[in-house]
């Protein structure tokens, strides 16, 4: 990959192994766990990142596992099945043959079942709401400055097209970032909102996926923006199918 420079590293994904074994001896970076070659000029898919995270040997781990109190998607970390495009397979199963259906960001959207469970299609998550609470500051941030800084972050760091950042809401100390991306809107080469949200989530937790870059240093007009809580909500193009038992629990 040309994006992986002469020193043969992957700037956008530290969970890779890079080697000059590509065509013509060019640098090629493969995701840990899956072995799939990744494009180092853009974000790696969340599925491949999760698989890499679960496969990295303890002694070689470069990323910190979240503490027991960390908020994680639904059922937390699991070793996913990814398709040859690097997307989540619609049906995920664990080692004990318990299966469930997931959406395009890998979050469970049905009750758990057995191997007979069918997941006909990978349902797209088209709306992501990132809910942040920042640490106390002397005063509230200016809303338009905050809006501009977060939009810049998603555009420059995560390479997400600005049109997919639908809105930034702010009521001190809560910040909400809305990402929207329908199937019809996503063109070839566009970063997926699910991938951008995952990179952002890991950045916020101090577990940056970028190679060699410093951690995320968010500042609004020079004032540090320190996040103390993150919740991420996912809305799918087709509503999830959970039993009433779960809904009333």
């Amino acid at each position: 990959h040309t994006a992986a420079q002469d020193n043969c590293t992957c700037p956008t994904n530290k969970m890779t192994v890079c080697s000059p074994d590509g065509p013509g001896g060019r640098c090629q970076c493969r995701a840990l766990g899956s072995g799939m070659a990744v494009d180092c000029s853009t974000l790696t898919s969340k599925c491949l990142l999760l698989k890499a995270r679960m496969s990295a040997p303890k002694n070689a781990r470069t990323l910190v596992r979240p503490s027991e109190h960390a908020l994680v998607d639904n059922d937390g970390l699991y070793d996913p099945d990814c398709d040859p495009e690097g997307r989540f397979k619609a049906r995920q199963c664990n080692q004990t043959s318990v299966c469930w259906c997931v959406n395009s960001v890998g979050v469970r959207r049905t009750d758990k079942g057995d191997l007979s469970l069918r997941c006909d299609e990978l349902v797209r998550t088209h709306h992501i709401l990132i809910d942040l609470r920042h640490r106390p500051t002397a005063g509230a941030f200016n809303h338009s400055d905050l809006d501009a800084e977060l939009r810049r972050l998603f555009r420059e760091r995560y390479r997400l097209h600005p049109k997919f950042v639908a809105a930034v809401h702010y009521e001190q100390p809560t910040i909400q970032i809305e990402l929207r991306q329908n199937t019809s809107q996503k063109a070839a080469g566009d970063v997926d909102i699910g991938d951008a949200a995952y990179y952002f989530e890991r950045d916020i937790k101090g577990e940056s996926l970028f190679q060699g870059r410093g951690g995320l240093d968010l500042r609004v007009r020079g004032e540090p923006l320190q996040v103390e809580r993150t919740l991420i909500y996912y809305l799918d193009e087709i509503p999830p199918k959970f039993s009433m038992k779960r809904l009333t629990a």
Partner: antibody
Framework: QVQLVQSGPEVKKPGASVKVSCKAS????????LGWVRQAPGQGLEWMGN????????NYNEKFKGKVTITADTSTSTAYMELSSLRSEDTAVYFC?????????WGQGTLVTVSS | DIVMTQSPDSLAVSLGERATINCKSS????????????LAWYQQKPGQPPKLLIY???TRESGVPDRFSGSGSGTDFTLTISSLQAEDVAVYYC?????????FGQGTKLEIK
């Protein structure tokens, strides 16, 4: 030039273990994936797993997990593939190979025979 | 796992004639990030290790005669020997190195008619 030289043939009894070596030369050992492939008599090729010696990352084919252990010694540019709890079905030629899009480099193969 | 299926299992072709071996994968081997097909073709003669002929579905390894060519994309691939020579008698394998575990086709035995 790139060369992978494997250890000689082995005859083992059922239940024993065997360790096959693969000495690499002619390239930077730590910069390339090195894989192991099995070929039972008259059969096809099966990928067993690989190792990236530079960072000791290892991948195993599920089929061989618990049966095979892949290691590498960077000081001698040598990779190893150990088979445990040998059975007659493990009788095969085992190849090491440098992996990659255009890495057509294979060891000569090591015949492991399991017989009582 | 990706399943690689070759056809035919065996093939007899006259010297100087064209030989065609097909390989079908159960999942696409095209990497959308770099538009590379992660498929290789190997030739194996008795008592020898496999020899790489083609990588990336269609790129000939250096030193391989130009009568060998590879084509195809996604899930369907073909190895063609344009004019069979006596030294081409061997077993031919396709291999996916797109995603772990890497898998091989069952092999095609090529003989002279």
């Amino acid at each position: 030039q790139v060369q992978l030289v494997q250890s000689g043939p082995e005859v083992k009894k059922p239940g024993a273990s065997v360790k096959v070596s693969c000495k690499a030369s002619g390239y930077t050992f730590t910069e390339y994936w090195l894989g192991w492939v099995r070929q039972a008599p008259g059969q096809g090729l099966e990928w067993m797993g690989n190792i990236f010696p530079g960072s000791a990352y290892i991948n195993y084919n599920e089929k061989f997990k618990g049966k095979v252990t892949i290691t590498a010694d960077t000081s001698t540019s040598t990779a190893y593939m150990e088979l445990s709890s040998l059975r007659s079905e493990d009788t095969a030629v085992y190849f090491c190979a440098r992996e990659g899009s255009n890495s057509g480099y294979w060891g000569q193969g090591t015949l492991v025979t399991v017989s009582s | 796992d990706i399943v690689m299926t070759q056809s035919p299992d065996s093939l007899a072709v006259s010297l100087g004639e064209r030989a065609t071996i097909n390989c079908k994968s159960s999942q696409s081997l095209l990497n959308s990030g770099n538009q590379q097909n992660y498929l290789a073709w190997y030739q194996q003669k008795p008592g020898q290790p496999p020899k790489l002929l083609i990588y990336g579905a269609s790129t000939r390894e250096s030193g391989v005669p130009d009568r060998f060519s590879g084509s195809g994309s996604g899930t369907d691939f073909t190895l063609t020997i344009s004019s069979l020579q006596a030294e081409d008698v061997a077993v031919y394998y396709c291999q996916s190195d797109h995603i772990y575990p890497y898998t091989f086709g069952q092999g095609t035995k090529l003989e002279i008619k």
